[in-house]
């Protein structure tokens, strides 16, 4: 039961995390105009990975996409790549983990296969979370560097009298969303890996004790696993989902409304 809970929770946490990574990647507020210690402008600038926006005090917002690939900073390209890799890995991880969930029955999939799939998805979630955290952190580092550079020459003279205000950018909401989402995906991945250990079948051979029932012979083995008809043919600890006795982890063998959550 604990294994199922850990796996399910890992899946849900990762799902939330990946949704957050997608949201952060699409958000426009990766960097926002720093308003502290700045003359109050009637224009507010903010930038995302894909476009930059200007919100005027009149209430109008204008966004322009970065329609160039070669003209963009290498760091921005790297952040984009990390976030996309994170999303792709996370999406594949989600797909794999759906089939790996203990509460979902797919044919006669063995526990060992589910364990392997759980581990695979867990690793994918961990890498996905790390990619998102790395991407956001690279962008944050870029912002900090640019912030102090622009602070150093915040007011650049223009013809002596006139001053130009350098627009400084600080952390936008997307960075925090990305960090949290990456962390959740990472935690979800770790939980999946922990669940995998509980799912992995032990290679123990159990001695079969036969019970002769009238009519036809059905052998039951200790541990509550239903064996195939006959004696001792199913010596490995395999579960055959066609009714019979059930283990603690297998209380909902028959399809029910909870099977496809």
């Amino acid at each position: 039961m604990a294994v199922t809970a850990c796996q399910g929770l890992g899946f849900v946490v990762s799902l939330i995390g990946i949704a957050g990574i997608i949201a952060a990647t699409c958000m426009d507020q990766w960097s926002t105009q720093d308003l502290y210690n700045n003359p109050v402008t009637a224009v507010f600038n903010y930038q995302g990975l894909w476009r930059s926006c200007v919100r005027e005090s009149s209430g109008f917002t204008e966004c322009r996409g970065y329609f160039t690939l070669l003209g963009l900073p290498a760091m921005l390209q790297a952040v984009r790549a990390l976030m996309i890799v994170g999303i792709v890995l996370g999406a594949i991880g989600l797909l794999v983990s759906i089939f790996a969930l203990k509460c979902i029955r797919i044919g006669s999939m063995e526990d060992s296969a589910k364990a392997n799939m759980t581990l695979t998805s867990g690793i994918m979630f961990i890498v996905s979370g790390l990619c998102a955290i790395a991407g956001v952190s690279v962008f944050a580092n870029m912002l900090v560097t640019n912030f102090w550079m622009s602070t150093a020459n915040m007011y650049t003279g223009m013809g002596g009298m006139v001053q130009t205000v350098q627009t400084r950018y600080t952390f936008g909401a997307a960075l925090f969303v990305g960090w949290v989402a990456g962390g959740l995906t990472l935690i979800g991945g770790v939980m999946m890996c922990i669940a995998c250990r509980g799912l992995a079948p032990e290679e123990t051979n159990y001695k079969a004790v036969s019970y002769h029932a009238s009519g036809h012979s059905v052998a039951y083995k200790p541990g509550g696993f239903k064996a195939s008809t006959g004696f001792g043919s199913n010596t490995k600890n395999k579960k055959i989902y066609d009714g019979g006795a059930r283990t603690e982890d297998e209380v909902q063998s028959y399809p029910s409304k909870h099977d496809y959550v």
């Epitope: 105009q33 003359p39 109050v40 402008t41 009637a42 224009v43 600038n45 930038q47 930059s52 926006c53 200007v54 005027e56 005090s57 009149s58 209430g59 109008f60 204008e62 322009r64 223009m158 006139v162 001053q163 130009t164 205000v165 350098q166 627009t167």
Partner: antibody
């Protein structure tokens, strides 16, 4: 587009409320600016109000002097001026705030004269 | 506050003449986010409210005759009337639309000879 109330003659210390009725556009979709013009000279921005949220912005000089309100049901913006002095004698305009932080539609202006 | 300085304060011209009005700002009005200059020009005819002519320093408002052209960047701006008409007799104001509080220039009065 913007129809303002008629001229006002007030005594010093009194208050006056100027109205500005909007028509022909979505009233709540645009902020409303208020501008002062003393004796036909330069223009002075007082501030603005967002009719949708009711948010107001005032210049330092007019804080405590001017108060903006709106009535969305009648698409009307109001500006109240308190504790009037001769300095407040001017023509007051309401103007729609649009793209580029511009004032694209203006009311015809309301003349306020403060005299004892 | 941003100081907007207009020159000349008044100008007497003949119909058909080309006119250039100047407006200088105490700080640059160029927004790095969209590379637009937040400077607006208004025309105020006698006894009338101001009328929007040009915004973003060079974008002509719809319905404004093509003879009105705005130019400049940063802190130096000009409004050019290629061929002055009788109906252009007015006061022209420039406005800082970038910094709070929004401030207007003192105006340039255009008079016909």
């Amino acid at each position: 587009q913007l129809q303002q109330s008629g001229p006002e003659l007030e005594k010093p210390g009194a208050s006056v409320k100027i109205s500005c009725k909007a028509s022909g556009y979505s009233f709540t979709g645009y902020k409303m600016n208020w501008v002062k013009q003393s004796n036909g000279e330069s223009l002075e921005w007082i501030g603005n109000i967002d009719p949708y949220y009711g948010d107001t912005t005032y210049t330092q000089k007019f804080k405590g002097k001017a108060t903006f309100t709106v009535d969305t049901s009648s698409s009307t913006a109001y500006m109240q001026l308190k504790s009037l002095t001769s300095e407040d004698s001017a023509v007051y305009f309401c103007a729609r705030y649009n793209r580029g932080n511009t004032m694209d539609y203006w009311g015809q202006g309301t003349s306020v004269t403060v005299s004892s | 506050d941003i100081v907007m300085t207009q020159s000349p304060s008044s100008l007497t011209v003949t119909a058909g003449e080309k006119v250039t009005l100047s407006c200088k700002s105490s700080q640059s009005l160029l927004n790095s986010g969209n590379q637009k200059n937040y400077l607006t020009w208004y025309q105020q005819r006698p006894g009338q409210p101001p009328k929007l002519l040009i915004y973003w320093a060079s974008t002509r408002e719809s319905g404004v005759p093509v003879r009105f052209t705005g130019s400049g960047s940063g802190a130096d701006f000009t409004l050019t009337i290629s061929s002055v008409q009788a109906e252009d007799l007015a006061v022209y104001f420039c406005q800082n639309a970038y910094f709070y509080p929004l401030t207007f220039g003192t105006g340039t009065k255009l008079e016909l000879r």
